[in-house]
C-alpha cells in the first residue's frame, strides 16, 4: 500500500503499560515538534482477542483517551474496578495527531492483567500480641471481583530478632496466627501475597511488606502480679 500522505508525524516513543495491583496505566514519551505552535494530541485504541478496535473514550472504557495532550492514559482513574476486565486479552495502540496529520499506530504487545500484573504487598497490616503468639490481620493488595476466577493466598516471613527466618503459608485468610512463639520475645515479620489465576494456572508472587517487629506477651500467669 502507498504511504499515507497524512502520516507525517513521528510516532510516540517507548509506550509502556503499568499494571500494578488494580492500576492499568498506559504512558509514552511526548512527540516533540519544533515547527508547530499547536499541541500534539494523542489517541489510544484498544481491542480484545476477536474484536475490532475501539477508541478509548468515556463510552467504551470509562475514561477519555482520545485527542488528549497528556502522555498517559489511566484506564482505572475512575475507580479501581474500572478499566479492562482482568482476565481479558487486551491489545493497545497509540498514535499522535496534529490537525489532519497523524503518526503511524504504535501497537503494544497484548496483555492480560492477571498474567502480567505486579502485585504489591498486603496493606493495613495490624498485629495483636498474645502469649507466645501474634495474630496478623491485613487487607488484600487489591480487590478481586470474582474469587472463583482468581484469588490471593498469603505467606508470612518471620524470625525472632537476630534469628533464622521462617515462612508460614500459604493461607487464604486475611488473618494469620503465628503460634508456638516464645513469650516476651521480639519477632520481625513481612507479609507477602501471591495471586493465583485458575484459568491459566498462573501465579504472580507479590512484593514483601516492610519489615516490622512485635513483642509477644509474657506468660499470663506471671505477668501482672503486682
Amino acid at each position: 500500500a502507498p504511504p499515507d500522505p497524512l502520516s507525517q508525524l513521528p510516532a510516540p516513543q517507548h509506550p509502556k503499560i503499568r499494571l500494578y495491583n488494580a492500576e492499568q496505566v498506559l504512558s509514552w514519551e511526548p512527540v516533540a515538534l519544533s515547527n508547530s505552535t499547536r499541541p500534539v494530541v494523542y489517541q489510544v485504541q484498544f481491542k480484545y482477542t476477536d474484536s475490532k478496535w475501539f477508541t478509548a473514550d468515556i463510552m467504551s472504557i470509562g475514561v477519555n483517551c482520545t485527542q488528549i495532550t497528556a502522555t498517559e492514559c489511566d484506564f482505572t482513574a475512575a475507580s479501581p474496578s474500572a478499566g479492562f476486565p482482568m482476565d481479558f486479552n487486551v491489545t493497545l495502540r497509540l498514535r499522535a495527531e496534529l490537525g489532519a496529520l497523524h503518526s503511524a499506530w504504535v501497537t503494544m504487545p497484548w496483555f492480560q492483567h492477571y498474567r502480567n500484573v505486579t502485585v504489591g504487598p498486603p496493606e493495613n497490616i495490624e498485629v495483636t500480641p498474645g502469649e507466645g503468639s501474634l495474630i496478623i490481620r491485613f487487607s488484600s493488595p487489591f480487590d478481586i471481583a470474582d474469587t472463583s476466577t482468581a484469588f490471593f493466598c498469603y505467606y508470612v516471613h518471620y524470625w525472632e530478632k537476630g534469628g533464622i527466618q521462617q515462612v508460614k503459608g500459604p493461607f487464604r485468610s486475611n488473618s494469620i496466627s503465628l503460634d508456638n512463639l516464645k513469650p516476651s520475645r521480639v519477632y520481625c515479620l513481612q507479609v507477602q501475597a501471591q495471586l493465583l489465576w485458575n484459568k491459566s494456572n498462573i501465579f504472580r508472587v507479590g512484593h514483601l511488606s516492610n519489615i516490622s517487629c512485635y513483642e509477644t506477651m509474657a506468660d499470663a500467669s506471671t505477668e501482672l502480679q503486682q
Epitope: 490481620r137 521480639v186 516490622s212 517487629c213 509474657a218
Partner: nanobody
Amino acid sequence: QVQLQESGGGLVQPGGSLTLSCAASGSIVSINPMGWYRQAPGKRRELVASLTNRGITTYADSVKGRFTISRDNAKNTVYLQMNTLKPEDTAVYYCHAYVDTGNYEYPQYENYWGQGTLVTVSS
C-alpha cells in the same frame, strides 16, 4: 518511657455500670492495638476487649453484648464501657497498649501495661 494512666474502677452492684479509661503518654510513634485485660485473684490474665486502628474489635465471649470498647486516637486514650456487671466480672482491670516508640531501625511494637484498676461487683 511510656506511661498508662487508668481510672474509673470501683465498687458497683450487680447489674450496674462503670466506664474505665486509660490514657497513654510518653515516647509514642504509634499504638496499635489498645485494650483491656483482667486478672481475678488466683486466675490467669484474660483479654477483655481490644481495638485496632482499623476498628477491629475483639471481645471475650463472657463480655460480648455487655462491654463496649472505644478509643480516642488523638488523645491516645481507650475506654471500656461496662454494663450489666456481674460478680464474676470482679477483677483487676489492666490497660494494655502495643506501642512503637520509634527507638529501633524498624517499627517495633512492645507491650505496655497500666498499674491496674480494681473493679468489684458485689451487693
